[in-house]
Amino acid sequence: GIAIPRNSGCPNSEDKNFPRTVMVNLNIHNRNTSTNPKRSSDYYNRSTSPWNLHRNEDPERYPSVIWEAKCRHLGCVKADGNVDYHMNSVPIQQEILVLRREPRHCPNSFRLEKILVSVGCTCVTPIVHHVA
Amino acid sequence: GIAIPRNSGCPNSEDKNFPRTVMVNLNIHNRNTSTNPKRSSDYYNRSTSPWNLHRNEDPERYPSVIWEAKCRHLGCVKADGNVDYHMNSVPIQQEILVLRREPRHCPNSFRLEKILVSVGCTCVTPIVHHVA
């Protein structure tokens, strides 16, 4: 294999915590998103599995505000507006990366963290377990 | 906002780039997820707005593999298995943070990037525009 020369333009890593601790540029680059993307718009109201968005706020985390979806019904909404309990509203979840201040209150020191968030809801056919 | 007192135990930040560049510990902490989470299970097949998962791979990014949802139909699947085109399958999108090496080839220098991903699909009532 070819050895990569240590690039003189790279940040210095002579740090007792290196290499677990690295430099991260927080000037966030938006790839394939506008500055103000029309995120999933008003789908939470128009969906047959509608959801409410709850604000999860933590000043020690970046991003400090995360919106969590909570399905409004156990069932799914029919065309007449009534809920069909033969179907299920379920949350679609995703693991995301966030930054957490560590040590706490330090303005420029963070740790990567993985959290599971509910992004929205979808209507699914239930799994029926038949009893013999 | 509340000013955070400079903690003497915090890493030094007297840097011309501060606070754009911060120290991040890459030992990922798992909050509220097991090491092997059961990701939204088989909802992509059981949903009335089913979706396929496509692999989006970029070795210069972390995570290198991101699974993107693409709705299978324009409409939504009815109980009889047919597609109802009076309803719409739409993607639920979320902005997520990823890491990208910057400058490229530097082993311990990264930049945060925000990308918009489709996590799954939901069935919505269409917006009907009436022409006068």
């Epitope: - | 092997n36 992509y44 692999r55 070795p59 972390y62 699974w67 082993p107």
Partner: antibody, heavy 124, light 109 residues
């Protein structure tokens, strides 16, 4: 707990097809948070990853470049197992073959469960 | 393909001593996708460390991993008799590239 049980012949003739099966208990071959792979080990080559399958609304296959033209990994959902087929074998394919579960979270990649290994000798 | 080079090939140490094993990649890899395995004769490899520094379930605290970019290290702080084995590093870069190092054998001096 999750276990992998390998089966298949220990002797294969040159130019023939090597076939091994890996039966899964305690997990599903269609799991959306795992991939199922084959790795082999020989004194000359060390540990060599051969390929994997994973299910994410459809089956995905990844094969090592070194064997891509000769390898097939197939799932059998009815028996909850997966198989390896390696065509046109030569004596260089003689090795201990392992099946393994790869934890396929997008944030990590590692083999946490291994089969017991099967020594396959290619000889006439 | 990325090549992983492990050194030394053999490490001769006594129980109680500290073992430092190196794994060097031919180009930068994500630490999150680097793992270490232990293998004893006649057995399948066993996962020790994933994500370069996370101990797998049931792995004793004397095992630790570190590194990023191209240089990774597995450290055994105080060798126990059962630690004498061969150790492999492995990385996933992108499909279809998953490679193993050639191994470091830790033997009793």
């Amino acid at each position: 707990q999750v276990q992998l049980q390998q089966s298949g012949p220990g002797l294969v003739k040159p130019s023939q097809t090597l076939s091994l099966t890996c039966a899964i208990s305690g997990d599903s071959v269609s799991s959306s948070s795992a991939a199922w792979g084959w790795i082999r080990q020989s004194p000359g080559r060390g540990l060599e990853w051969l390929g994997r399958i994973s299910y994410r609304s459809k089956w995905y296959n990844d094969y090592a470049v070194s064997v891509k033209s000769r390898i097939t990994i197939n799932p059998d959902t009815s028996k909850n197992q997966f198989s390896l087929q390696l065509n046109s074998v030569t004596p260089e394919d003689t090795a201990v073959y392992y099946c393994a579960r790869e934890v396929d979270s997008i944030y990590y990649s590692y083999f946490d469960i291994w089969g017991q290994g099967t020594l396959v000798t290619v000889s006439s | 393909d990325i090549v992983l080079t492990q050194s030394p090939a053999t490490l001769s140490l006594s129980p109680g001593e500290r073992a430092t094993l190196s794994c060097r990649a031919s180009q930068n890899v994500w630490a999150f996708y680097l793992a270490w395995y232990q293998q004893k004769p006649g057995q399948a490899p066993r996962l020790l460390i994933y994500g370069a520094s996370n101990r797998a379930t049931g792995v004793p605290a004397r095992f630790s991993g570190s590194g990023s970019g191209t240089d990774f290290t597995l450290t055994i702080s105080s060798l126990e008799p059962e630690d004498f084995a061969t150790y492999y590093c492995t990385q996933y870069y992108s499909s279809p590239s998953l490679t193993f190092g050639q191994g470091t054998k830790v033997e009793i001096k």
